[in-house]
Structure formats: C-alpha cells, structure tokens
C-alpha cells in the first residue's frame, strides 16, 4: 500500500510508529522545561529484575508550533520527549545536573514512549479559505524498558504524530467549524 516509506512533513519531533517518519524538528518558539517528571514512577511493564521500581525515566517537555507547508498551528502544543538512559530515580536529577551518567552494569534500560495522546490542531494558512486541521500524536508518558542484545535499534525509536476531534451530525458547514475540535485530546496506550 503506497510507497516504501512514508512521511508527514510537519515539525513533529517524534516519528510515528514507522508509518510517518518525521524529519528533524524545526522547533518554533521552543521552550524546554526539562523536568524529570517520572521520578520514582513504577514502569508500565515489569522487567525481570528485582529493583524495578527504582528505575526512572526523564520526560522532557517542549512547547512548539505544528507546521504543515506554509501553515502553522493556531496554538502551540506541548511535546514530551523521552530522554535516553534510565537509572535509579534518586540519581537522575543530580547525576544529570553534574553531567555524569549512571549506567547499569548488566541489562540496558532505555527510556521510551509508553502512552500517547492525540491532539487535533487547527492550522492557520496564508490566504486559506477553508479551515484546515491536522492530527498530531504526541507522547503522553515514558517508561523504562529493558533491552537485551536481541533488541535492535528500532526498539529505541520514539514514536508519534496525530490526534483528536468535534461532534457528529453537523449541519452545512459554518466557516468557523473546526475550532470546536481544537482542544479535543485523548490518550492511547499501545
């Protein structure tokens, strides 16, 4: 179905499940909040290790506009990026702050997307007559996943790009219609 590889051209940071690989981000008005959000949260899936609850993931937040061609989202979206290596929660903030990094001896734990939220964004386009919208799937949370030597690089890929919507049974389209969908959001576990 379709070409061998696919893309969607917006500035999403994260490629979407292999279907829509994204180019590198062009972040507009990018504010990095750089918070370690997930400290101490137990991972979504148990690993075969006893101190699972000790492992923590860094979730970095970026605020940016979604673009598509000459269009830009009316409002910025907040993108969550799962940051690299997992380590014991108590070591993460200080270790990162000092530029050091804890590495486990033994299995490799990586911080990868866990759940997604999808958001529909309204696009503002130059001279655009019709309201246009785009769906962007964004990472909602991260998790630590144990990687063995059998896991390949594809395990480490982040995923994402798409989104949400308004209500059924519409009468003939009023011009402002799609604004009702702007804030619709959902969360999806994969």
């Amino acid at each position: 179905q379709g070409w061998q590889a696919f893309k969607n051209d917006a500035t999403e940071i994260i490629p979407e499940l292999g279907e829509y690989p994204e180019p590198p981000p062009e972040l507009e008005n990018n504010k990095t909040m750089n918070r370690a959000e997930n400290g101490g949260r137990p991972p979504h899936h148990p690993f075969e290790t006893k101190d699972v609850s000790e492992y923590s993931c860094r979730e970095l937040h970026f605020t940016r506009y979604v673009t598509d061609g000459p269009c830009r989202s009316a409002k910025p979206v907040t993108e969550l990026v799962c940051s690299g290596q997992c380590g014991p929660a108590r070591l993460l903030p200080n270790a990162i702050g000092r530029g050091k990094w804890w590495r486990p001896s033994g299995p490799d734990f990586r911080c990868i997307p866990d759940r997604y939220r999808a958001q529909r964004v309204q696009l503002l386009c130059p001279g655009g007559e019709a309201p246009r919208a785009r769906k962007v799937r964004l990472v909602a949370s991260c998790k630590c996943k144990r990687l063995t030597r059998f896991h390949n690089q594809s395990e480490l890929k982040d995923f994402g790009t798409e989104a949400a919507r308004p209500q059924k049974g519409r009468k003939p389209r009023p011009r402002a219609r799609s604004a009702k969908a702007n804030q619709a959001e959902l969360e999806n576990a994969y």
């Epitope: 969607n8 061609g69 386009c125 919208a133 308004p166 209500q167 389209r173 619709a184 999806n188």
Partner: antibody
Framework: QVQLVQSGAEVKKPGASVKVSCKVS????????QHWVRQAPGKGLEWMGW????????EYASKFQGRVTMTEDTSTDTAYMELSSLRSEDTAVYYC???????????WGQGTTVTVSS | DIQMTQSPSSLSASVGDRVTITCKAS??????VAWYQQKPGKAPKLLIY???TRWTGVPSRFSGSGSGTDFTLTISSLQPEDFATYYC?????????FGGGTKVEIK
C-alpha cells in the same frame, strides 16, 4: 504497514442506499481523518468529504450534502460511507483514504465498485 | 467551486524523457495543491503536496512547482513504472477538487 481494506462490489437500484466499509489497520482510525473519493467509469476523481473519527466531525462536499453520511466504528477501526437516493450517475468506484490532515489523502483503500442500475 | 484544468489530457513519451504536466486553477490557491498517480485498476497514490513537497518514498525524479494559479508536475527521467494517469488536487477551499487527469502513455 498502513492498510485500508474496503467491502466488496455492490449493485443497487435507483433510489436505494449503499453503505461501503473501510477497515483500517496499522494505526488507530481515530488518529487520522477519513476521506471518501469516488471515480466514475473512465472519469476523474471527485472528493466527497472527510470525517474525524475521534469526535465525529464531518465535512461533506456540497454536492453530496443531505445524501451522504460518513461514520466510523473506532472499536473495530472501520469507516463507513452511506450514500442514499442513488441514481445511475452514482455508478463509480468509491475509495476510502486516510491522512493526518483534512486536505490530503495519504493512504488509499483498493476501491469498491457501486453499480446503480434498474 | 475551484476548477482545476490539467494539460495535456494525454501524452506519449519514452523511457528517459523529461515529462511536464501542468495544472491551472480557476482562482488563486496559493500553494494548496497535491499531485497523485493512478495506475489502471488501482487506487491513486500521493506524490506531492503543498505544490512542491515530495511524499516520502516518492522517487526524486518527481518534482512539483508553482503557486497561485499555475502548477507543474515534472518527471525528470521517465521510468517504465511511471506510465500512469496523474491528477492535481486543490485544497485551498471546499470542496476539494481534482483536475481531469493527464494520461502518460508509452510512445
């Protein structure tokens, strides 16, 4: 791999309705917009409308307004297009397509032939 | 409705030829134009959107250009698999509309 698989060919009488289905796999249907485009025999492409399965928003071409209904079942990732009051000029191949925007058609189904004949 | 007029309606070309298809909009559509390729008995495939952005996986021999009312799809070196019908589509204003198609045949 994104795949859209449509229901089989239909033969209908004038005045009847037809409902075409489109099963989406490869991602949740609600993460994209669903579009419907038709093509009469030997003719070009004609956009019918789009729907947003997440919230049920729809946009129909004015030509089909009042005759077309686009719905989805998000539990089965299936989109439906129902066209009523069929006439002979509705004989066409009906395609479902999906995309992350309301305006371009990224992936397409294989098409469903609808023949309207008395 | 915005009319999209494609020319020529058909053309004959040989493998290796440079092929140019044009699409003229009945009013200014900025760059809100996509191009699709359709082979007989098959569904169309997206090639180009926003007038010049190639859909990933589309070979680099396909390129699009134009803005306003005049748009062009160029195949720099025609390959055997490129013999098909090509359609332009505008998405500046509802309803989205397609051109009548250009059939590229083997000379």
């Amino acid at each position: 791999q994104v795949q859209l698989v449509q229901s089989g060919a239909e033969v209908k009488k004038p005045g009847a309705s037809v409902k075409v289905s489109c099963k989406v796999s490869g991602f949740p249907i609600k993460h994209h917009f669903q579009h419907w485009v038709r093509q009469a025999p030997g003719k070009g492409l004609e956009w019918m409308g789009w729907s947003d399965p997440e919230i049920g928003d729809t946009e129909y071409a004015s030509k089909f307004q009042g005759r077309v209904t686009m719905t989805e079942d998000t539990s089965t990732d299936t989109a439906y297009m129902e066209l009523s009051s069929l006439r002979s000029e509705d004989t066409a191949v009906y395609y479902c397509a999906t995309g992350d925007t309301t305006y371009k058609f990224d992936f397409w189904g294989q098409g469903t032939t609808v023949t309207v004949s008395s | 409705d915005i009319q999209m007029t494609q020319s020529p309606s058909s053309l004959s070309a040989s493998v290796g030829d440079r092929v140019t298809i044009t699409c003229k909009a009945s009013q200014d559509v900025h760059t809100a134009v996509a191009w699709y390729q359709q082979k007989p008995g098959k569904a169309p495939k997206l090639l180009i959107y926003w007038a010049s952005t190639r859909w990933t996986g589309v070979p680099s021999r396909f390129s699009g250009s134009g803005s306003g009312t005049d748009f062009t799809l160029t195949i720099s070196s025609l390959q055997p698999e490129d013999f098909a019908t090509y359609y332009c589509q505008q998405y500046h204003d509802y309803p989205w509309t397609f051109g009548g198609g250009t059939k590229v045949e083997i000379k």
